[in-house]
């Protein structure tokens, strides 16, 4: 039975040209995390694998930094980055947990952050 839950940074907004940290946290399970995937809609952004470390997809290499923690930092944001992002935790023996974050990239300088982790 899957007992875990994923907390995410929820709906967040950021300014065009700026950067944002996407964070998820898996809690309430003793399952071992073997890999965390970060995806944007159907595109793979990055993987953090227990044995192999971080892999950033070539098309995002210049704009995506691994971390902090199991999170992901998106840099040089464009309006096209607006959309859904998913953290997918692969665990043993539970299976897969998925968290969703919606990012809105704003043109103006009045972007305000929604609910966020205190860990940036």
């Amino acid at each position: 039975m899957m007992t875990g839950t994923i907390e995410t940074t929820g709906n967040i907004s950021a300014e065009k040209g700026g950067s944002i940290i996407l964070q998820c946290h898996l809690s309430s399970t003793t399952a071992q995390v073997t890999q965390v995937n970060w995806e944007q809609q159907d595109q793979l952004l990055a993987i953090c694998n227990a044995d192999l470390g971080w892999h950033i997809s070539p098309s995002f290499k210049d704009r995506v930094a691994p971390g902090p923690g199991l999170g992901l930092t998106l840099q040089s944001l464009t309006v096209n980055d607006t959309g859904e992002y998913f953290c997918i935790y692969h665990t043993y023996p539970d299976g897969t947990y998925t968290g969703r974050i919606f990012l809105e990239v704003l043109e103006s300088s009045v972007a305000e952050h929604g609910a966020r982790f205190q860990i940036p």
């Epitope: 965390v36 971080w54 930094a65 902090p68 860990i119």
Partner: antibody, heavy 117, light 107 residues
């Protein structure tokens, strides 16, 4: 298996600089953050900063900005830490370490830096 | 910066005794906490990562618990080889910070 081999002890003069190294083997160097930790005799552990060789990203403890510079040479799988304007306060053992949230941390054997006139 | 308050700073315990060391973060760090053992003139050794996960090769008498702000390292039955200094480390955001250490000695 993962190994981090650090350079040997250094005896350096106050006001000068020193560059110590950490050669990684047994894993893909560009895929993991590599950090540096300071330990003065009789003191605890202090995090200096870390570097992600795959993109050159760095994080520094504010206290060590301007003191430590972290670099990495991916061709030789070696990370470096340069310490500048050395004083007696910089005399310490410096450890390199490799970690992820998913596997824990591997440590180098430490490099003793002694600053003395 | 997040401050890690570790206690006790030193302690004596008897062989076979259950020993608990605690670390308190100044704010929520989720599960981004590791525990290390260090012996004199040696590199630290990872015991626990991600708050509760036992590192490879570490005896099962060591365990970690907690999340958020309060964490603990427990040795279920103390052995002579456990004489060392123990440190916690939070690694969820830069700068990472260590606890002050706990020096554990045998009575």
């Amino acid at each position: 298996q993962v190994q981090l081999q650090q350079s040997g002890a250094e005896l350096v003069r106050p006001g000068t600089s020193v560059k110590i190294s950490c050669k990684a083997s047994g894993y893909t160097f560009t895929n993991f953050w590599l950090g540096w930790v300071k330990q003065r005799p009789g003191h605890g552990l202090e995090w200096v900063g870390d570097i992600f060789p795959g993109g050159g990203y760095t994080n520094y403890n504010e206290k060590f900005k301007g003191k430590a510079t972290l670099t990495a040479d991916t061709s030789s799988s070696t990370a470096y830490m340069q310490l500048s304007s050395l004083t007696s306060e910089d005399s310490a053992v410096y450890f390199c370490s490799r970690s992820t949230m998913l596997t824990g941390t591997y440590w180098g054997q430490g490099t003793l830096v002694t600053v003395s006139a | 910066d997040i401050k890690m308050t570790q206690s006790p700073s030193s302690m004596y315990a008897s062989l076979g005794e259950r020993v608990t060391i605690t670390c308190k973060a100044s704010r929520d760090i989720k599960s981004y906490l590791s525990w290390y053992q260090q012996k004199p003139w040696k590199s630290p050794k990872t015991l626990i990562f991600y708050a509760t996960r036992l590192a490879d090769g570490v005896p099962s008498r060591f365990s970690g618990s907690g999340s958020g702000q309060d964490f603990s390292l427990t040795i279920s039955s103390l052995e002579s080889d456990d004489t060392a200094t123990y440190y916690c480390l939070h690694h969820g955001e830069s700068p990472y910070t260590f606890g002050g250490g706990t020096k554990l000695e045998i009575k």
